[in-house]
Interface confidence: low
Amino acid sequence: YYGCPSECTCSRASQVECTGARIVAVPTPLPWNAMSLQILNTHITELSESPFLNISALIALRIEKNELSHIMPGAFRNLGSLRYLSLANNKLQVLPIGLFQGLDSLESLLLSSNQLVQIQPAHFSQCSNLKELQLHGNHLEYIPDGAFDHLVGLTKLNLGKNSLTHISPRVFQHLGNLQVLRLYENRLTDIPMGTFDGLVNLQELALQQNQIGLLSPGLFHNNHNLQRLYLSNNHISQLPPSIFMQLPQLNRLTLFGNSLKELSPGIFGPMPNLRELWLYDNHITSLPDNVFSNLRQLQVLILSRNQISFISPGAFNGLTELRELSLHTNALQDLDGNVFRMLANLQNISLQNNRLRQLPGNIFANVNGLMTIQLQNNQLENLPLGIFDHLGKLCELRLYDNPWRCDSDILPLRNWLLLNQPRLGTDTVPVCFSPANVRGQSLIIINVNVAVPSVHVPEVPSYPETSWYPDTSSYPDTTSISSTTELTSPVEDYTDLTTIQVTDDRSVWGMTQAQSG
C-alpha cells in the first residue's frame, strides 16, 4: 500500500482525486488498491508509457480538463479491470493505435471535447465490450468504414458537434445493439439510404443542426424501436411519403427550422405514441384534410412561424387528445367554422400574428375546455355574437392589436368584455381603430353613442352571461396555465445535446410576459 500523493486527496484510499495547475505529471506513488482515479484541471500535457502500471485494480479513470495533447501507446497498459475511461476536455489531436489495447473490461470511453481530426478502425478494434463511446465536440471530418465494426455491444454513440460532411452507409452496420446515436451539429448534407438499416434497437437518433436536404424514402424503415427522432434545423424541403411509416414507438419528433413547404395526408404515422410535433419555422403554406389523422395521442402541435394561408376543414381530424395548438405567425385570413370541431380536449390555441378578418360564430363550438385563446395582431373588426359564451374554463383571451370597428355592432362584444375584463390581461387592452374619432380608445369603455352619433343605438341586448363575474377572488389560479408549454422548444433529455433552444423562448409560442414568469 502506498500513501496518497501530496497533490491528491484520497478517500478510503480506493478513490483518488488529483487536481490543480501545479500538477504537470501523473502523481506518484498512487495507492495500489485505487479503484477510481480522477486527474482534473491540471497542466499535464503528456501521458508517458505505463504511468498506471501499479494500480491494476482501477475501475474508473477520469483525466479531464487538462492540457493533455500527447499520449504514448502504452499509457493504459495493465488496466485490464478498467470499465470507465474519460479523456474528455483535453487537447488531443491524435490517438495512437493500440492505445486501448488490453482494456478488455472497458465499457465507457469518453473522448469528447478534444481536437481529434480522425479515427481509424484500429483504434477501437480491441474494445469489444464497449457500451458507450463519446466522440462529440471534436474535429472529425469523416468516419471510415470499419471504425466501429468491432463494437458490437455498443449502446450509445455520440458523434455530435464534429465536422462530418458525409456518412458512409456501412459505418454503423454492425451496431445492432445501439440504442442512442447522435450526429447533431455536423455538416451532413444527406444520409445515404441503408445507413441506419442495421440499427434495429435504436431508440434515439439525433440529426438536428446539419444541412440535410433530402431524406431517402426508406431511411428509417428498419428502426422500429425508435422513440426520439430529432431532424430540426436542417434544410429538409420535403418528406418522402413513407418516411415515418415504420416508427410505431416514436414519441418525440422535431422538424422545426427546416424548409418544408407541404405536408401530405398520412405522412405522419401511424405513430400511436407521439405526444408532441414541432413544425414551426418551416415554409408550410396549407394543411390538407387528415394530415395528422394517425396521431391519436398527440397533445402538442406547433405550426407557428410558417406561411399557412389555408387550413382544410378536416386538417385536424383524429387529434382528439390535442391540448395545445399553435398557429401563430402565419398568413391565415379565414378559418372554416368546423376546423377545430374535432379538438374536444384543446386547452390552448394561439392564432396571433395572422391576417384573420373574421371568425365564424361556431369556430370554438365543440372546444369547450379552451383555457387560453390568442387572437392579437390580426385584422379582426368584430366577433360573432356569443362566440365565447360556452367556454366556461376560458381564463386568458388576447384581443389587442386588431382594427376593432367601434360602431353599434360592437356592443355585444364590448358588454361581454366588460363582464370578463380580467380574462383580457393587464398588459394590453383592445382599442378601437374606427371610426376615426374614437381611434385609440379602449374598446371596453368606449361610449358607442359618441363613436357613431348618427346611428340609433338599440338597448344593450341581454348577452348571455358566462359563469364568470369580475370578482377576482373567485377565479381559479391561472398563472401557470400553459406557462411552460409554448415557452421553449422541446428540450432534449440529455445534457450534451444543447442545440434545440430557441433564441426568444416566447417567440415560438407567443406567450405573454405574464405567462412567462
Partner: antibody, heavy 119, light 111 residues
C-alpha cells in the same frame, strides 16, 4: 496534376493469377479511394473493388469476392489489384481510378492495363 | 446485365440537345445524391463529366448538365458538337453488396 500510371499489358493462362499496379503522383494518396474498374472488349464498365489507404480495409464487389485482392502501399503511393483463378472471360482492360472515399466518383483514371487470358 | 439501365444509343445533330437517362432503384440512384457520368472515347480511359448528380468538375463544358428525379438520373448535352460523340456511362453509389454500380453505357452519335 494527379497522375495514375499502371503497369503494362499481361498475357495469362487460365487458372493463373495476375497482379496489376497503379502508381499515384501529384496528390494525397492516403485519403482517396483507389478503385479498380474493368472493361471487357466491346462491353461496359464494371467495378471490382476499392481501397482507401488510410483506412486499410478494401471493399470488393460481390461478384469478385474471394478472387480479387486489393492492397495499397502508402510508402510508394502504389495500389495493387490481384485477380486469381483467371478464366477467358476475365480478358479485359483493367483501370485504376481515384475518387473520394465516401462516394466513389472517379475523377482521375489510369491509362488502363490489358490482361489477356488465353490458353 | 448492368445494374443501371441506359438506352443503348442516342443521336443528335450538331447544335441540338440530347438527354441520356439512367434508371436504377431506391437502393442506388434513388437513395443517394451520388450519381456520376463518364465520357469514354474509343481506346481511351473514361473521363468524369458530372458528379453528385449535377456538379461539373473544372474543365468540363457547361454544355453538360445532370439531374435526378426519383430513381432516374439524366445527362443533358446541349449544343451538340462532333467531339461529343462517345460512349457515356452513368454510375451510382449503391446500398447493396456492391458499393458502385455502372450503367451499360450509351453510344452517342453526332449526325
Amino acid at each position: 496534376q494527379v497522375q495514375l500510371v499502371q503497369s503494362g499489358a499481361e498475357v495469362k493462362k487460365p487458372g493463373s493469377s495476375v497482379k496489376v499496379s497503379c502508381k499515384a503522383s501529384g496528390g494525397t494518396f492516403s485519403t482517396y479511394a483507389i478503385s479498380w474498374v474493368r472493361q471487357a472488349p466491346g462491353q461496359g464498365l464494371e467495378w471490382m473493388g476499392g481501397i482507401t489507404p488510410m483506412f486499410g480495409t478494401p471493399n470488393y464487389a460481390q461478384k469478385f469476392q474471394g478472387r480479387v485482392t486489393i492492397t495499397a502501399d502508402e510508402s510508394t503511393s502504389t495500389a495493387y489489384m490481384e485477380l486469381s483463378s483467371l478464366r477467358s472471360e476475365d480478358t479485359a482492360v483493367y483501370y485504376c481510378a481515384r475518387g473520394d472515399w465516401y462516394d466513389y466518383h472517379f475523377d482521375y483514371w489510369g491509362q488502363g492495363t490489358l490482361v489477356t487470358v488465353s490458353s | 446485365q448492368s445494374a443501371l439501365t441506359q438506352p443503348a444509343s442516342v443521336s443528335g445533330s450538331p447544335g441540338q440537345s440530347i438527354t441520356i437517362s439512367c434508371t436504377g432503384t431506391s437502393s442506388d440512384v434513388g437513395g443517394y445524391n451520388y450519381v456520376s457520368w463518364y465520357q469514354q472515347h474509343p481506346g481511351k480511359a473514361p473521363k468524369l463529366m458530372i458528379y453528385e448528380v449535377s456538379n461539373r468538375p473544372s474543365g468540363v463544358s457547361n454544355r453538360f448538365s445532370g439531374s435526378k428525379s426519383g430513381n432516374t438520373a439524366s445527362l443533358t448535352i446541349s449544343g451538340l458538337q462532333a467531339e461529343d460523340e462517345a460512349d457515356y456511362y452513368c454510375q451510382s453509389y449503391a446500398n447493396r453488396d456492391n458499393f458502385v454500380v455502372f450503367g451499360g453505357g450509351t453510344k452517342l452519335t453526332v449526325l
